[in-house]
């Protein structure tokens, strides 16, 4: 309704003597700002005066505030929105109705708020979930309809009068909707908490008791059981009797059914609190427990381990592992069902007792072929000795032994021969299935363990074979000792170290890489002519005529090998120089005369120089000197000089005669 002032605040506020009240409040006036505010206690409207009567706890006018009693009551609001109030301390006689008389310029309003002040601090209220089950987390809530800024309080949880370890979360609300203090505690109750008292205690800031609330926990849980057995150690011999009793120590709600379990499986027709076992057998050994159920679920007792003792049963042997590899470790395990466990063992290998072996396990750290055979054992405990079982077979596997490579050929072997070898061995487990040969080659294996080398190479030095089952055993290599003609025969210049110049002392060496047999002979030849029979060919003073193609031969009892032809090159200065003339040494003036410097040189002439009859050098650098047109005064002796990297050579003089042409003679 638009003619009303709008207020928001809690309907009733609760406190106790000496505490305080904080009243959260908001409003909206009909018009303009608040001009006057009076707080009444139990106001009553006086029709005669058209005013409200009652105790004025607080008053505020245009002129300013009227001091209240020691400022016990405070208006914390403003002129348009906030109407929050505080009373501190609050007294029992403050209970009743508070009236907020508000006046603006043209409008008036009376807003009523209930105040409930008790003589003593009122108790908080504990809220529990509808059902509590063991081990399921629940939240306990303690609520107090009180909160005031000027009066701090705390809520503490106690279980059977002892503070609870779990951390509680306390929250406070001081809003226009609600005023309260709340503590929440998360808690996982156990079956043992059933029937226990939980208290929420209200305390002041110093921890002084103010009030409390208590509840008794109703924790739903499965039956809690205890099992008793006769005899108490649950150890009996075959034929004895055993009694087990099941007692319920707690159940909420009451139990409904009883059953017995052996090794987790339910025993049929056993639905009472007592289990009687008569003339037990060893098969009845095991873990027993009783199970009692209620609406929450089944509860189980602790397990009782019933041991029915008996003498060892016939034993079996387990081998880790068979077949075993020679050199590996092997463990034998004697397995025999017995209770109590066997205290002594007797071991047999191929029916013969193994001395000093009395343990359940026999460990052989390094297996050898003679360890193969049948292993059996006998177990013994306080009740007797068992029987020897069938035993277990140990198979010891090993690589082929004493492998040898044997040459079948008559010796010596020559390069190109066909060689046959066989691979022999002494023993093997498992059997030999294949053979290997080293080095690898494109060789023939006509039968298992036989190798045929066609056209044996000079460098087939050694051959080794391996006999293989799961492993390969290699024989020591055998030397074929192949005999062959000298190899890699070549001519090598020993001196001079650099190029050969005419007049040098020259030594050539006939080298070869290998020969078998070692004894060799040498032969030197040039152009099919025998020059010497030493490993070296020597020239005291080499001449250009010694240049040419040289070969050396090396032979032994197997054959002979020739080197590649080696070219001997002799470097020499230009020699045998001569000047040739074209078309001849007599030429008519006006024609062309070509002079050519001919020579023998190694390396070839790199530079030519021409000279006239007065040894004057002519400006030509080529092998040919061309005079065109030639003149009569060019008649004379000419010579040339040739130069290469070794030196110089000069020609003898050659005379050119230039004669007059008929025209010249005619003019004279």
């Amino acid at each position: 309704d638009s003619s009303k002032w709008v207020f928001e605040h809690p309907e009733t506020l609760y406190a106790w003597e000496g505490a305080c009240v904080w009243i959260p409040c908001t409003y909206r006036a009909l018009d303009g700002d608040l001009e006057s505010f009076i707080l009444f206690h139990n106001p009553e409207y006086n029709k005669n005066t058209s005013k409200f009567d009652g105790t004025r706890l607080y008053e505020s006018t245009k002129d300013g505030k009227v001091p209240s009693e020691q400022k016990r009551v405070q208006f914390l609001g403003d002129k348009n929105k906030n109407c929050t109030l505080s009373i501190h301390p609050v007294h029992l006689n403050d209970s009743g109705q508070l009236g907020l008389r508000m006046e603006s310029k043209t409008e008036k309003w009376m807003e009523r708020i209930h105040l409930n002040v008790s003589e003593r601090p009122f108790p908080p209220h504990i809220q529990l979930p509808p059902e509590i089950q063991e081990s399921q987390e629940v939240t306990l809530t303690c609520l107090l309809n009180f909160s005031c800024y000027g009066y701090p309080i705390q809520l503490q949880w106690l279980l059977e009068g002892v503070p609870m370890r779990q951390a509680a979360v306390t929250s406070t609300s001081l809003t226009i909707k609600s005023v309260f203090t709340r503590s929440e505690l998360k808690f996982s109750p156990q079956w043992s908490h059933h029937g226990k008292i939980v208290t929420c205690q209200l305390q002041d800031a110093d921890g002084k008791f103010l009030s409390n609330d208590t509840v008794q926990l109703n924790v739903k849980h499965t039956p809690k059981l205890e099992i008793k057995v006769t005899p108490s150690d649950a150890i009996v011999r075959e034929g004895d009797s055993v009694t087990m009793t099941c007692e319920v120590s707690s159940s909420n709600p009451e139990y409904t059914t009883v059953s017995w379990l052996k090794d987790g499986t339910s025993l049929k027709k056993q639905n009472t609190f007592t289990l009687n076992l008569r003339e037990v057998t060893k098969d009845q050994s095991g873990k027993y427990c009783c199970q009692v159920s209620n609406d929450v679920g089944p509860g189980r007792s602790e397990e009782v381990f019933l041991q029915v003792q008996y003498a060892p049963e016939p034993s079996t042997v387990q081998i880790l592992h068979s077949p075993a590899v020679e050199g590996s470790q092997v463990e034998f395990l004697c397995m025999s069902l017995a209770n109590p466990l066997p205290t002594n063992y007797t071991w047999y290998h191929n029916g013969k007792e193994m001395q000093g072996r009395t343990e359940e396990k026999v460990h052989i750290p390094k297996i050898l072929p003679w360890h193969a055979g049948t292993y059996s054992c006998v177990a013994e405990n306080i009740l007797g000795t068992g029987q020897r079982g069938p035993g277990a077979e140990l198979d010891v596997q090993y690589p082929p032994k004493k492998v040898t490579t044997v040459i079948q050929n008559p010796m010596p072997i020559r390069e190109g021969d066909t060689v046959t070898l066989s691979c022999n061995y002494n023993s093997s487990n498992p059997s030999v299935t294949r053979y290997e040969w080293k080095p690898h080659g494109a060789w023939e294996e006509p039968s298992l363990g036989v190798l045929k080398i066609q056209n044996v190479g000079w460098d087939n030095t050694t051959i080794a074979c391996a006999a293989c089952n799961s492993w390969c055993s290699w024989a020591s290599p055998v030397a074929l000792n192949v005999q062959y003609a000298p190899r890699d025969v070549r001519v090598r210049k020993i001196k001079p170290l650099s190029e050969i110049h005419s007049g040098n002392s020259v030594s050539l060496q006939c080298d070869f890489s290998s020969s078998h047999p070692k004894e060799v002979q040498f032969f030197w030849e040039k152009n099919g002519r025998l020059l010497g029979k030493e490993s070296q060919l020597n020239f005291d003073s080499i001449s250009p005529e010694d240049a040419g193609s040289y070969s050396c031969w090396v032979n032994n009892s197997i054959g002979q090998t020739a080197s590649k032809a080696w070219t001997l090159e002799v470097l020499y200065a230009p020699r045998r120089l001569r000047v040739s003339m074209s078309p001849g040494d007599q030429v008519m003036e006006g024609k062309s005369a070509t002079l050519t410097c001919e020579s023998d040189a190694n390396p070839p002439v790199s530079h030519y120089t021409w000279f006239d009859w007065n040894n004057q050098s002519l400006p030509y650098h080529s092998q040919k000197l061309r005079l065109e047109p030639v003149k009569v005064q060019h008649s004379g002796a000419y010579w040339c000089q040739g130069t290469n990297s070794v030196g110089k050579g000069r020609s003898p003089l050659s005379t050119l005669t230039v004669y007059y042409s008929p025209e010249t003679i005619g003019r004279r």
């Epitope: 530079h607 007065n614 002519l618 080529s622 003149k631 005064q633």
Partner: antibody, heavy 127, light 112 residues
Framework: EVQLQQSGPGLVKPSQTLSLTCAIS??????????WNWIRQSPSRGLEWLGR?????????DYASSVRGRVSINVDTSKNQYSLQLNAVTPEDTGVYYC?????????????????WGQGTMVTVSS | QSALTQPASASGSPGQSVTISCTGT?????????VSWYQQHPGKAPKLMIY???NRPSGVSNRFSGSKSGNTASLTISGLQAEDEADYYC???????????FGTGTQLTVLL
């Protein structure tokens, strides 16, 4: 300092004879380590060696195959000069003509380069 | 007798190096160590810069150097200067009756 001074007409009619002279100062034509050369330059043919003369025990001359038969080099030792005669000229013979020396000895070793040049004469063959 | 082959043009900035090649045959460049290099400014006579492959006449800057490999000769100008802008010609003695052959010429531009 060796200098070569060229002289001769700049315009020659086709089929006539081109005649140029090169006067030498600072060196003798009779030197037995020099040769005396004629070279021409034209946009179409570039630099082209035409011929040379030199004196050792007598006078010698050499000519390029491209002009051999219509070229001659004459010497006047009294004036220490040499000349080029090129007969039967055509417009193809238009270009700048240079005389140049080659000194063949550089210390004890042989050498061969045009180390001194004349100033050049622009010759145009045109009717 | 064919002329020796040179690149038509070459260029470089001041301070840089430039190399000009001259390719002939075994009858000229490859056969003799008588290769020479000439510098020619417009309207002027050629000037000898390098003779006998790698020798420098007195008065020529040591920025100019020559070399030869097989049938190809080279002229290298280091630390280029503006005054190096000119035409460059190579020449070689030859075994033919035309005793000397020249290169086609290279125009060198100095980029300023």
């Amino acid at each position: 300092e060796v200098q070569l001074q060229q002289s001769g007409p700049g315009l020659v009619k086709p089929s006539q004879t081109l005649s140029l002279t090169c006067a030498i100062s600072g060196d003798s034509m009779l030197s037995n380590s020099d040769t005396w050369n004629w070279i021409r330059q034209s946009p179409s043919r570039g630099l082209e060696w035409l011929g040379r003369t030199y004196h050792r025990s007598t006078w010698y001359d050499d000519y390029a195959s491209s002009v051999r038969g219509r070229v001659s080099i004459n010497v006047d030792t009294s004036k220490n000069q040499y000349s080029l005669q090129l007969n039967a000229v055509t417009p193809e013979d238009t270009g700048v003509y240079y005389c140049a020396r080659v000194r063949l000895q550089d210390g004890n070793s042989w050498s061969d380069a045009f180390d001194v040049w004349g100033q050049g004469t622009m010759v145009t063959v045109s009717s | 007798q064919s002329a020796l082959t040179q690149p038509a043009s070459a260029s470089g900035s001041p301070g840089q190096s430039v190399t000009i090649s001259c390719t002939g045959t075994s009858s000229d460049v490859g056969g003799y160590n008588y290769v020479s290099w000439y510098q020619q400014h417009p309207g002027k006579a050629p000037k000898l810069m390098i003779y006998d492959v790698s020798n420098r006449p007195s008065g020529v800057s040591n920025r100019f150097s020559g070399s030869k490999s097989g049938n190809t000769a080279s002229l290298t100008i280091s630390g280029l200067q503006a005054e190096d802008e000119a035409d460059y010609y190579c020449s070689s003695y030859t075994s033919s009756s035309t005793l000397y052959v020249f290169g086609t010429g290279t125009q060198l531009t100095v980029l300023l």
